[in-house]
């Protein structure tokens, strides 16, 4: 089935430069590898900036979005750009930095229930056609008041892991990103290699939970590289703990 080809873990344990929480320590889920390009630009600095090509926002880091670098530029040439801060113009939620969302074309501050601010509200910002086909995943439009004060539960649409309740992370599933459970000890994970083929990942698992890392299962050491089973295992040492 497609599932066997596409199923994978694509979160914390990616080695640079393919991403992972190392580049964005505040992010529970790293950039989701995309069909066209794997990973996102995880080491963007003013002094050493290397544009990272992308097809969707989710291929970029938590503090980035995917767009043409020039206004009205060629939609076929898209890179990961730094997110827009408060009061900057936007066209979609993913363009705004964490802690903000796009409302009426402007990045505005949000509390932890940020994506509830769109209740029954149509935002139809128009900036011409730039970015019109580059839109990524939005925080959930919560249309039910019962969910107004709760973070995303399992299966809820999300943009970032901060949209999800504790113990969950935001990961790709089919054509959306949803809140899924963080992996527990013994659960299967996939540790991507630097030059691995991530092109078809549309099913993602969360990262391994705190105190765990994605490692080859001991009794699978003799297996061929392609069939090595990775599971979430306890750290032998106390470094690299991950906080949700």
């Amino acid at each position: 089935t497609l599932n066997s080809v596409l199923n994978s873990n694509a979160i914390k344990n990616l080695p640079p430069p393919l991403g992972g929480a190392a580049g964005h320590p505040g992010s529970a889920v790293s950039a989701a590898p995309g069909i066209l390009y794997p990973g996102g630009n995880k080491y963007q600095t003013i002094d050493n900036y290397q544009p990272y090509p992308c097809a969707e926002d989710e291929e970029c880091g938590t503090d980035e979005y995917c767009a043409s670098p020039t206004r009205g530029g060629d939609a076929g040439v898209q890179i990961c750009l730094a997110c827009r801060k408060r009061r900057k113009r936007c066209m979609r939620h993913a363009m705004c930095c964490p802690g903000n969302y796009c409302k009426n074309g402007i990045c505005v501050s949000s509390d932890q229930n940020h994506f509830r601010g769109e209740i029954e509200e149509t935002i139809t910002e128009s900036f011409g056609n730039d970015h019109s086909t580059l839109d990524g995943y939005s925080r959930r439009t919560t249309l039910s008041s019962k969910m107004y004060h709760t973070k995303g539960q399992e299966g809820s649409v999300c943009l970032r892991s901060s949209d999800c309740a504790s113990g969950l992370c935001c990961a790709r599933h089919f054509w959306s990103k949803i809140c899924k459970p963080v992996l527990k000890e013994g659960q299967v994970c996939t540790k991507h290699r630097r030059k691995g083929s991530h092109g078809l990942e549309i099913f993602q698992r969360c990262y391994c939970g705190e105190g765990l890392s994605c490692r080859i299962q001991k009794d699978h050491h003799q297996a061929s590289n392609s069939s090595r089973l990775h599971t979430c295992q306890r750290h032998h040492h106390h470094h690299h703990h991950h906080h949700h």
Epitope: T1, L2, N3, L6, N7, G34, I35, A55, E56, D57, E58, C66, M91, R92, H93, A94, C102, E118, E120, E121, T122, I123, S132, T133, L134, D135, G136, Y137, S138, R139, R140, T141, T142, L143, S144, M147, E154, G155, S156, V157, A171, H173, F174, W175, S176, I178, K180, P181, I202, F203, R205, C206
Partner: antibody
Amino acid sequence: EVQLVESGGGLVQPGGSLRLSCAASGFTFSSYAISWVRQAPGKGLEWVASVSGGGRTYYPDSVKGRFTISRDNAKNSLYLQMNSLRAEDTAVYYCATSLENYAFDYWGQGTTVTVSS
Amino acid sequence: EIVLTQSPATLSLSPGERATLSCRASESVDDFGISFMNWYQQKPGQAPRLLIYAASKQGSGIPARFSGSGSGTDFTLTISSLEPEDFAVYYCQQSKELPPTFGGGTKVEIK
């Protein structure tokens, strides 16, 4: 209020083409995935195509190569270009989106496509 | 693809009675710690409406009398006390694998 309104259905001969549209309102269209689901007369539901917020497309084998899903975020619109139509494509076509969870949680009222000679 | 089989095909009940609808998958629809099973209600001439997702979570604005349960391959939709407006066709749908597939439906009719 979330609204999805389909249009473009009609009668077409086998082998013909038709383009369906779905006008969306009440949510930030450009940020969400959206899909087409169809229902043949007196039958169950069948997924037809989906497109992610960023424009990635997905199809079942039954329509791959014949149908093309696309979106125009500037117009808050979804489209389904249907070519090489067959009698078995006769159905009510719904656009549906996933705003709150991964399931199809909001649906339009549908547009009817009849393929017959 | 995952095949979903719903039973019974038709359920004849009276208002106020309890309805129990079954959906069986040809393989497990559990993954990532979630049961990717959804339930929809459809009335004649209308679009489907999401009732339950992730096996047991209620969709927005869905009355509490609708509940879902199950995991793996066997799932149940329960309507605790049928209201007149609940007589309709109910479909299960899996989202574990592409393509997403639907069951054949269960018609709940007035006895």
